[in-house]
Amino acid sequence: MSDSKCDSQFYSVQVADSTFTVLKRYQQLKPIGSGAQGIVCAAFDTVLGINVAVKKLSRPFQNQTHAKRAYRELVLLKCVNHKNIISLLNVFTPQKTLEEFQDVYLVMELMDANLCQVIHMELDHERMSYLLYQMLCGIKHLHSAGIIHRDLKPSNIVVKSDCTLKILDFGLARTACTNFMMTPYVVTRYYRAPEVILGMGYKENVDIWSVGCIMGELVKGCVIFQGTDHIDQWNKVIEQLGTPSAEFMKKLQPTVRNYVENRPKYPGIKFEELFPDWIFPSESERDKIKTSQARDLLSKMLVIDPDKRISVDEALRHPYITVWYDPAEAEAPPPQIYDAQLEEREHAIEEWKELIYKEVMDWEERSKNGVVKDQPSDAAVSSNATPSQSSSINDISSMSTEQTLASDTDSSLDASTGPLEGCR
């Protein structure tokens, strides 16, 4: 592809403070978000006749963090094929050689909104449980490939007006160090599990904590643990859930344990008070049962000690969620990750540049040879559990349809996806 690549295939357009140089098939570019990795635009794919999201990774090898994340994202997007994880439709670079190589463009499915926008809506139990079910299916699929996310948050989960949901990114690399006393970076930490905040070991149910935080936010309409930094984040957790047991404290590193044990002791607030009946939908007797189930699920997900927290499988079988259970979605075959050293890779910048370039060239080669599907697949599994047309869940009618696929949008261009302040 690089041999035959010519300037006539591309055109440039100014988007915000960046120049997008994209294939001519992608027209009507419009910025929809910006994140740590770059700017995201909505566009119309004139070949497929669909709207897509085009994400520009500008100099993805500029430092170790960007390089590792870009390489990991490329490899995983190419391997993972599940209806609850965003699909990669195309990858390209306008540069012709490795020496010139500067930018990577990822073309993905375009969704209608991210969960930040859904949080401000009055969701009924049907919609809420279906969104949570899909989140859990996507997470379980990642776990089956050995990918533990650790950084799920509303800005990186996108939905369509028919209530279908997809996870946008792959979270923190296994090698990403998270230190309790670390300098606070400008990232959203509200959804990170105690074991991540406290620099402990972690297992798959680290992601259940994040789902619990997101569910709590969908119910309350505001962030449930809104700390200003790691330390304050921990304070917000214990103020509401109570100081954890001595058994939990024993699992902490000495310096962290010393800090945690010297915090004021909190008894914790009952879940009936944290999530009272009146904040849930309550239009029928059935809603009262569902409210009780929802609160029970929250109480099992928002458990500080990971050894006592519900697992993904258990959550999928919970009465609040299990009504949607479909083995084709919840037990989809695991993706085959072709880079066995993906999480452990350490390279100099010049090597990262080469690895990322190879991944892009590999995609271009495969698509040139017709290996890559020339249409968006509806993922590896078909949905038997999608609610019937008669169900009101098929339309989140009041949703803002400002299209979005802004991964890691802690600073979004769209005001409606900005930080959440007061509760409704």
């Epitope: 050689t97 160090c177 970076y185 100099a348 910048i349 010049e350 090597e351 080469e354």
Partner: antibody
Framework: EVQLLESGGGLVQPGGSLRLSCAAS????????MSWVRQAPGKGLEWVSA????????YYADSVKGRFTISRDNSKNTLYLQMNSLRAEDTAVYYC??????????WGQGTLVTVSS | DIQMTQSPSSLSASVGDRVTITCRAS??????LNWYQQKPGKAPKLLIY???SLQSGVPSRFSGSGSGTDFTLTISSLQPEDFATYYC?????????FGQGTKLEIK
């Protein structure tokens, strides 16, 4: 055993050129990146340039950009540094070094480059 | 460019002493920090990589710690062969940069 042997250093006039070579042995040369690091007399270490395993990706310190060119011949297990428009401040011992992961784990013994009229 | 600042620039100590050298980066470099030892007329030698990992063959009295912007090299009990100049280096982004060095001398 990893061995890196630099050659090509010497005395050159300002504005002149010099080509340094580094013969590598004891490891699969084409596998990883290589760097040049220099040390002016009595001073600290200064990274000069790096090149990826295939030779397609190169990086330079601002102080040498446009004047120095790093290259490699994987069939000969040799790393090169072409130095043009040399200046007095380029006087230093030049070390060839092997990149391993994100660090430099083996260094040659160095070759002295003196730029003086 | 990321600036690396070492302190102290020189240090006098005795055999058996515990010695600490610090290195500060002008911006966060995660754990992408390496420590090198150099003796007069010799090439540098890698001691610690990734902030805290000991290079094979290096005595266990050498240890490294830190993350983000502040890093430390510690020699738990100085030996005669440890008197040398020590450099930190970041490998987080190009241009890769070194600290100015810390000369460790016999008291």
């Amino acid at each position: 055993e990893v061995q890196l042997l630099e050659s090509g250093g010497g005395l050159v006039q300002p504005g002149g050129s010099l080509r340094l070579s580094c013969a590598a042995s004891g490891f699969t040369f084409s596998y990883g990146s290589m760097s040049w690091v220099r040390q002016a007399p009595g001073k600290g270490l200064e990274w000069v340039s790096a090149i990826s395993g295939s030779g397609g990706s190169t990086y330079y310190a601002d102080s040498v950009k446009g004047r120095f060119t790093i290259s490699r011949d994987n069939s000969k297990n040799t790393l090169y540094l072409q130095m043009n428009s040399l200046r007095a401040e380029d006087t230093a011992v030049y070390y060839c070094a092997r990149g391993h992961g994100s660090n430099i784990d083996y260094w040659g013994q160095g070759t002295l480059v003196t730029v003086s009229s | 460019d990321i600036q690396m600042t070492q302190s102290p620039s020189s240090l006098s100590a005795s055999v058996g002493d515990r010695v600490t050298i610090t290195c500060r980066a002008s911006q966060s470099i995660s754990s992408y920090l390496n420590w090198y030892q150099q003796k007069p007329g010799k090439a540098p030698k890698l001691l610690i990589y990734a902030a805290s990992s000991l290079q094979s063959g290096v005595p266990s009295r050498f240890s490294g710690s830190g993350s983000g912007t502040d890093f430390t090299l510690t020699i738990s009990s100085l030996q005669p062969e440890d008197f040398a100049t020590y450099y930190c280096q970041q490998s987080y982004s190009t241009p890769y940069t070194f600290g100015q060095g810390t000369k460790l001398e016999i008291k």
